[in-house]
C-alpha cells in the first residue's frame, strides 16, 4: 500500500479469482483512543472499533472511503483505491490502446518545435467518475524539471455504438535549449482514477522524435504567363523554431485531382516555392518536415487550383 | 526518406555539401544496423545514449546561432580551446567563434573516425561476419575533415589485445551510430546556418 495523496491510498493486488488479497491496517488520524468506530462509504454498518482497523482487501467491494467516527462525529477518512496486477502486468482498463505508432500506445505526444513545449493526449470510453493527474521530467534517475498543466477534455467522438473522449495536457520543459542534443528522454506519467480503480501510464521520448511542424502558412499560387504552370509559394509556420536557417524544413508539394483515384504529382523541395502544373479542379497541398531529422510530416496546407 | 542532394554553387559554403552527404551516410548506416541487428537492442528506445565527445568538445555551444545566445538554457558553456585555422569559410568571414565552432566539429569527426575504425577492425574478426561499417560513411567523414582542413595531432587507432566480445561490440556500434547521427544533424544545421549568413 502507498499514499497517492493525502488520505488516498493505493492497494496493489495480484488480480486473479480467489486471490488472498492484501492485509491493510488503517489508523484513525486522531489523538482519541477510545470509542472509535469504522464504516465504509455510505453504509452505517460498523466494521470494527478501535484506533486501528485491519481489513483483507481482495476485490473492489473492499475498496472505498473508510471513515472513523466517535460519538457521531467524523474523525478522519482514508480512501482505498485498487491497482490490479494481472499476471505480472498492471491493468490498462481506463485508457484505450491507440495502437499508433505501435501496440500498447496509450499516451501520444507531439511538439510543434524544439522549444521544449509538447502536448500529450489519450483516449477513453469512460465519461464519469474519472480523474487524471500528469507529471513529467527529463530523465528519471536525476530528473530535471518539466511543468505540466491540468489534463482537460479536448474532444468527444462517436465510434460505432461508443462515445470516445480525448483528454490532453500541455507540458513545458523548464530550461530547454532548442539547439541541444538530447541524451535523456522526457518521461511523462499519467495517474488515472476511475471510481475505485487506480492505473498509471507512462511514455518516454525525445522531443526530436515527436516533432510535427504546423502546416506551412500563406500558401499562394501565381500563374505563369502563357503556361499551365503555376508558382506555388508558402512560408514557414509561425510556431516553428528560429532561426530558420538553422532549424530548416523540407517540403512536399502535391497536386491532387478531385478524385482520390487520380494520380498524385509530388515534388520535394527545400525552398519555399515550387513550380507545378495546375490541372482543372485539382488542389495544391504543401506539408513540412524537419529537413535533417525525419520525424513526422505536418498536416497539409491546401489551395484550389482555380 | 532520402534527403535531397544539393549541388553547391562554386561560391557556396563548401562544407554544406559534405555535411549533407555525412548525414545521409550515417542515417543509411544506422538503418542498416537496425535491420541487420534486429535481435540486438539497437533501437533508440533500447540503447543508452552516450556521447563520446562529452567534455572533450562543445560543438552545440560553440556553434550556437547568434539568435539563441540570449537563451540562458543554451549557455551552460564549457571552456574548450581549439586550433583556429579552418578553411571552410573565406578567411575574411572567419570570426574567432566560427573557427572555434568549425574546429569543434573537426574534433568530433576525428574522434568518431577513430572509434569507427577501431570498431570495424573488431567486426572484421567476427566469424558471423554480420555487419561492417559502410566504407562510404568513413570516406564521407574523411572528406568533411579535409574540407574543414584543420591541423591537429593524429589520434592513434586504439588496438586491443584481448579477444573482442562481438555482442558488446555490436551494441556499442548501435550506440555510436545513434550518437553520431544526432551530431551529424547538428553539423548539418550549423553548416546551413553558416551558409545562410
Amino acid at each position: 500500500i502507498w499514499e497517492l495523496k493525502k488520505d488516498v491510498y493505493v492497494v496493489e493486488l495480484d488480480w486473479y479469482p480467489d486471490a488472498p488479497g492484501e492485509m491493510v491496517v488503517l489508523t484513525c488520524d486522531t489523538p482519541e483512543e477510545d470509542g472509535i468506530t469504522w464504516t465504509l462509504d455510505q453504509s452505517s454498518e460498523v466494521l470494527g472499533s478501535g484506533k486501528t482497523l485491519t481489513i483483507q482487501v481482495k476485490e473492489f467491494g473492499d475498496a472505498g472511503q473508510y471513515t472513523c467516527h466517535k460519538g457521531g462525529e467524523v474523525l478522519s477518512h482514508s480512501l482505498l483505491l485498487l491497482h490490479k496486477k494481472e499476471d505480472g502486468i498492471w491493468s490498462t482498463d481506463i485508457l484505450k490502446d491507440q495502437k499508433e505508432p505501435k501496440n500498447k500506445t496509450f499516451l501520444r505526444c507531439e511538439a510543434k518545435n524544439y522549444s521544449g513545449r509538447f502536448t500529450c493526449w489519450w483516449l477513453t470510453t469512460i465519461s464519469t467518475d474519472l480523474t487524471f493527474s500528469v507529471k513529467s521530467s527529463r530523465g528519471s534517475s536525476d530528473p530535471q524539471g518539466v511543468t505540466c498543466g491540468a489534463a482537460t477534455l479536448s474532444a468527444e467522438r462517436v465510434r460505432g455504438d461508443n462515445k470516445e473522449y480525448e483528454y490532453s495536457v500541455e507540458c513545458q520543459e523548464d530550461s530547454a535549449c532548442p539547439a541541444a542534443e538530447e541524451s535523456l528522454p522526457i518521461e511523462v506519467m499519467v495517474d488515472a482514477v476511475h471510481k475505485l480503480k487506480y492505473e498509471n501510464y507512462t511514455s518516454s521520448f525525445f522531443i526530436r522524435d515527436i516533432i510535427k511542424p504546423d502546416p506551412p502558412k500563406n500558401l499562394q499560387l501565381k500563374p505563369l504567363k502563357n503556361s499551365r504552370q503555376v508558382e506555388v509559394s508558402w512560408e514557414y509556420p509561425d510556431t516553428w523554431s528560429t532561426p530558420h536557417s538553422y532549424f530548416s524544413l523540407t517540403f512536399c508539394v502535391q497536386v491532387q485531382g478531385k478524385s482520390k483515384r487520380e494520380k498524385k504529382d509530388r515534388v520535394f523541395t527545400d525552398k519555399t516555392s515550387a513550380t507545378v502544373i495546375c490541372r482543372k479542379n485539382a488542389s495544391i497541398s504543401v506539408r513540412a518536415q524537419d529537413r535533417y531529422y525525419s520525424s513526422s510530416w505536418s498536416e497539409w496546407a491546401s489551395v484550389p487550383c482555380s | 526518406r532520402n534527403l535531397p542532394v544539393a549541388t553547391p554553387d562554386p561560391g557556396m559554403f563548401p562544407c554544406l555539401h559534405h555535411s549533407q552527404n555525412l548525414l545521409r551516410a550515417v542515417s543509411n548506416m544506422l538503418q542498416k544496423a537496425r535491420q541487420t541487428l534486429e535481435f540486438y537492442p539497437c533501437t533508440s528506445e533500447e540503447i543508452d545514449h552516450e556521447d563520446i565527445t562529452k567534455d572533450k568538445t562543445s560543438t552545440v555551444e560553440a556553434c550556437l546561432p547568434l539568435e539563441l545566445t540570449k537563451n540562458e538554457s543554451c549557455l551552460n558553456s564549457r571552456e574548450t580551446s581549439f586550433i583556429t585555422n579552418g578553411s571552410c569559410l573565406a578567411s575574411r568571414k572567419t570570426s574567432f567563434m566560427m573557427a572555434l565552432c568549425l574546429s569543434s566539429i573537426y574534433e568530433d569527426l576525428k574522434m568518431y573516425q577513430v572509434e569507427f575504425k577501431t570498431m570495424n577492425a573488431k567486426l572484421l574478426m567476427d566469424p558471423k561476419r554480420q555487419i561492417f561499417l559502410d566504407q562510404n560513411m568513413l570516406a564521407v567523414i574523411d572528406e568533411l575533415m579535409q574540407a574543414l582542413n584543420f591541423n591537429s595531432e593524429t589520434v592513434p587507432q586504439k588496438s586491443s589485445l584481448e579477444e573482442p566480445d562481438f555482442y558488446k561490440t555490436k551494441i556499442k556500434l548501435c550506440i555510436l551510430l545513434h550518437a553520431f547521427r544526432i551530431r551529424a544533424v547538428t553539423i548539418d544545421r550549423v553548416m546551413s546556418y553558416l551558409n545562410a549568413s
Partner: antibody, heavy 115, light 112 residues
Framework: QVQLVQSGGGVVQPGRSLRLSCAAS????????MHWVRQAPGKGLEWVAF????????YYADSVKGRFTISRDNSKNTLYLQMKSLRAEDTAVYYC????????WGQGTMVTVSS | SYVLTQPPSVSGTPGQRVTISCSGG????????VKWYQQLPGTAPKLLIY???QRPSGVPDRFSGSKSGTSASLAITGVQAEDEADYYC????????????FGTGTKVTVLG
C-alpha cells in the same frame, strides 16, 4: 471454490458453426478477463482468444480472426466462443481459462470438424 | 507459430535432476514473466510455476523455475514416476499482450 464447466463441443461438418460455453462459479466472474485455449490431438497448446472483464476489448489469434467470436454474459456468469466457417484444422480440445498469475481451467470440450 | 522453443523430450531415472529449457526473445521472455504448466494425458494443464520462479501452494518443492535474459528453465530435482507428463512454458509478447504465448512443449519420460 473456483469452477469452470464447459459445454457445447461435438462433431460438425466443415463450414458449419458451433458455440462453446463456459459457466463460471465460485468467484466474481465480472471482474476477470477470460481466455480460450485449444489443443489439437497430439499437439501443443494454442491460444485462441481473450476478452476483458467487461467485454470491452477482444483479442484473437490470427488463425481464427474473422471466424471466431469471444463474448461473455456477466449476468449469467458465462463465457462463449462462437465458431463459424469451421475447418478440419480447428479440430481440438477447447479450454476456457481465467486470466491471472494463478489460473483456473475448464475441463475441456472436444470439437471435431469432419465430413 | 510458436515463438518459445522447448526441447521435444527429456528423460531421466527416478531421483535424477531433469531440466527443461524455454528459449524466447527480447519482446517476450525478455520483457515478461514466465509460467510453467504440467499436463497429464487427457487432463487440463496444471500450473506449476508463475512469475518465473514462484510455486503455487500444493506444488511439490522439487519443481523450480528460473529466468535469465530471454530464456527460462524448469528443473525437477529428484524426478518421480508421476512427473511423467507434457510440460509447457508460457509468456506474453509485449506487442500482442494479452495473447498467451506457449512453448512447443516437452515430453518428460521417467525411465525404469
Amino acid at each position: 471454490q473456483v469452477q469452470l464447466v464447459q459445454s457445447g463441443g461435438g462433431v460438425v461438418q466443415p463450414g458449419r458453426s458451433l458455440r462453446l460455453s463456459c459457466a463460471a462459479s465460485g468467484f466474481t466472474f465480472s471482474e476477470y478477463g477470460m481466455h480460450w485455449v485449444r489443443q489439437a490431438p497430439g499437439k501443443g497448446l494454442e491460444w485462441v482468444a481473450f476478452i476483458r472483464y467487461d467485454g470491452s476489448n477482444k483479442y484473437y489469434a490470427d488463425s481464427v480472426k474473422g471466424r471466431f467470436t469471444i463474448s461473455r454474459d456477466n449476468s449469467k456468469n458465462t463465457l462463449y466462443l462462437q465458431m463459424k466457417s469451421l475447418r478440419a484444422e480447428d479440430t481440438a480440445v477447447y479450454y476456457c481459462k481465467t486470466h491471472g498469475s494463478h489460473d483456473n481451467w475448464g475441463q475441456g470440450t472436444m470439437v471435431t470438424v469432419s465430413s | 507459430s510458436y515463438v518459445l522453443t522447448q526441447p521435444p523430450s527429456v528423460s531421466g531415472t527416478p531421483g535424477q535432476r531433469v531440466t527443461i529449457s524455454c528459449s524466447g526473445g527480447r519482446s517476450n521472455i525478455g520483457s515478461n514473466t514466465v509460467k510453467w504448466y504440467q499436463q497429464l494425458p487427457g487432463t487440463a494443464p496444471k500450473l506449476l510455476i508463475y512469475y518465473n520462479d514462484q510455486r503455487p501452494s500444493g506444488v511439490p518443492d522439487r519443481f523450480s523455475g528460473s529466468k535469465s535474459g530471454t530464456s527460462a528453465s524448469l528443473a525437477i530435482t529428484g524426478v518421480q514416476a508421476e512427473d511423467e507428463a507434457d510440460y509447457y512454458c508460457q509468456s506474453y509478447d509485449r506487442g500482442t499482450h494479452p495473447a498467451l504465448l506457449f512453448g512447443t512443449g516437452t515430453k518428460v519420460t521417467v525411465l525404469g
